[in-house]
Amino acid sequence: LVPHLGDREKRDSVCPQGKYIHPQNNSICCTKCHKGTYLYNDCPGPGQDTDCRECESGSFTASENHLRHCLSCSKCRKEMGQVEISSCTVDRDTVCGCRKNQYRHYWSENLFQCFNCSLCLNGTVHLSCQEKQNTVCTCHAGFFLRENECVSCSNCKKSLECTKLCLPQIENVKGTEDSGTT
């Protein structure tokens, strides 16, 4: 079975690597433009140069191409707490990230928000904070984990999942109340 190729892939596959088929003349293979440049004019004939121009400020191409326009540089999303790690250049898009002691939470494939790493107060760090994952905490006795924070068992209500973790404390409280009534 032959895999289905898109029109552009079909056209490109006829030419050797690093070249593309002339859109008006499929007997001509033109050299692709280097990263940091874009296609201004196709090569006029076999063995002749493709007219490639450098990307203007605020745009880039990160690989060899035959694009008619450079791609616009990404902007870091300040409302998501993002900071610029490295600026856009003609051959590389802007790199956005988070500040120190923060991690990324992805709302979608390409969109992340920065959040502060949990400090595990009243607990210990089980797994350190990573680029895309918050710290994993283990709580001290008398505390339970709620939204990745160690909360006192005195805040544990019977309906919450904490009852198993806080059971000894709850039993102790109940026991002291009972002993006071005798």
């Epitope: 939470h105 992805y106 709302w107 979608s108 494939e109 390409n110 969109l111 928000q113 959040f115 918050n134 939204e147 990745n148």
Partner: nanobody
Framework: EVQLLESGGGLVQPGGSLRLSCAAS????????MYWVRQAPGKGLEWVSA????????YYADSVKGRFTISRDNSKNTLYLQMNSLRAEDTAVYYC?????????????WGQGTLVTVSS
């Protein structure tokens, strides 16, 4: 079959409050980011708020920050949006959505929406 059913919309005076609910079924609700998106009359979609699977991370658009609160109850497969200090510009159809799109307004599944009208 994935279903998202919004409720709680209605007519409210400026400064008033409403609580929207979204009942989810047909997928593992507790595993997904959930979103509230709105569309004002004659305008495009606006991403209002989002909440992570366990509710630890939340996002709010600048236009609603400090007034709206997103929450979820995974035991009830329900998403909420508490809307306080409502303004005329909050008038819109509010949709809950689920999924991981390639950008902020691309979702796998949508509800049918609930209309919120803020007017005196």
């Amino acid at each position: 079959e994935v279903q998202l059913l919004e409720s709680g919309g209605g007519l409210v005076q400026p400064g008033g409050s409403l609580r929207l609910s979204c009942a989810a079924s047909g997928f593992t609700f507790a595993k997904y980011n959930m979103y509230w998106v709105r569309q004002a009359p004659g305008k495009g979609l606006e991403w209002v708020s989002a909440i992570s699977p366990k509710g630890q991370q939340t996002y709010y658009a600048d236009s609603v920050k400090g007034r709206f609160t997103i929450s979820r109850d995974n035991s009830k497969n329900t998403l909420y949006l508490q809307m306080n200090s409502l303004r005329a510009e909050d008038t819109a159809v509010y949709y809950c959505a689920e999924g991981m799109g390639s950008d902020a307004i691309t979702f796998d599944y949508w509800g049918q929406g609930t209309l919120v009208t803020v007017s005196s």
